[in-house]
Interface confidence: low
């Protein structure tokens, strides 16, 4: 799967993680920091 950095328009989309753009799927995706989950890495879990 080809990935690249999200456009600047998506700044702030991922609350606790890095936004990556899945080129083949034309979708933005949040790569969450450790301890976070959710579409925007909005949920913390232990």
């Amino acid at each position: 799967v080809s990935i690249t950095k999200c456009s600047s328009d998506m700044n702030g989309y991922c609350l606790h993680g890095q936004c990556i753009y899945l080129v083949d799927m034309s979708q933005n995706y949040c790569r969450c920091e450790v301890g976070y989950t959710g579409v925007r890495c909005e949920h913390f879990f232990l």
């Epitope: 600047s8 328009d9 998506m10 700044n11 702030g12 609350l15 959710g38 909005e42 913390f44």
Partner: antibody
Framework: HLQLQESGPGLVKSSETLSLTCSVS??????????WGWIRQPPGKGLEWIGS???????YYNPSLKSRVTISADTSKSQYSLKLSSVTAADTAVYYC????????????????WGNGTTVTVSS | DIQMTQSPSSLSASVGDSVTITCRAS??????LNWYQKKPGKAPKVLIY???SLQSGVPSRFSGSGSGTDFTLTISSLQPEDFATYYC?????????FGQGTRLEIK
């Protein structure tokens, strides 16, 4: 300076759709770094967030209202709108539009610019 | 959703007093907490964002503190224009929620 102004009918019949528009002057809703939202305050009650959108397409809604709410934008007119379907008396409130800034490093989403609010009454 | 609970619901104070309003989140929200002042017939006004950052143009007698689940808004040396209703608001998750409000009245 930036100003927001809500407009729409002050009276809506029960079971019908409430439609409001927020007109933005002195700025653009397609400016990078800002979300644009709707908040309401029922009589004698607290503030309730309805939903917000970012011009590039991200739109978020209050889960308790999600099935009835649509927020859309007309960037050419620098306006955005709220549609709330199947209204009841519980939807009677003052409705505000507001801007909330964000950036990559923080996501505090505090509403820094508000409209004056418009009162909507749902009648049976 | 994250529930925000403010206390007290109302309080009375005099001009010159110092008052503290508390906001508690139902789960940890780091410092994703904002405070607003609301007067009847007027739009809310942001006072504090990120738990402790003073919004531009807001008098320094307003201050915020806290992290995790417990937060406070302190108003030192109350002025006549400070009597209003105050709301906390979290933005830790996509679904923004407000506290129920604290009404500050003149004693």
């Amino acid at each position: 300076h930036l100003q927001l102004q809500e407009s729409g009918p002050g009276l809506v019949k029960s079971s019908e759709t409430l439609s409001l528009t927020c007109s933005v002057s002195g700025g653009s809703i397609s400016s990078s770094g800002y979300y644009w939202g709707w908040i309401r305050q029922p009589p004698g009650k607290g503030l309730e967030w309805i939903g917000s959108f970012y011009y590039s397409g991200n739109t978020y809604y209050n889960p308790s209202l999600k099935s009835r709410v649509t927020i859309s934008a007309d960037t050419s007119k620098s306006q955005y709108s709220l549609k709330l379907s199947s209204v009841t008396a519980a939807d009677t409130a003052v409705y505000y539009c507001a801007r909330h800034p964000f950036n990559w490093n923080d996501h505090y989403h505090y509403m820094d610019v508000w409209g004056n609010g418009t009162t909507v009454t749902v009648s049976s | 959703d994250i529930q925000m609970t403010q206390s007290p619901s109302s309080l009375s104070a005099s001009v010159g007093d110092s008052v503290t309003i508390t906001c508690r989140a139902s789960q940890s929200i780091s410092n994703y907490l904002n405070w607003y002042q609301k007067k009847p017939g007027k739009a809310p006004k942001v006072l504090i964002y990120a738990a402790s950052s003073l919004q531009s143009g807001v008098p320094s007698r307003f201050s915020g503190s806290g992290s995790g689940t417990d937060f406070t808004l302190t108003i030192s040396s109350l002025q006549p224009e400070d009597f209003a209703t105050y709301y906390c608001q979290q933005s830790y998750i996509t679904s923004i929620t407000f506290g129920q409000g604290t009404r500050l009245e003149i004693k």
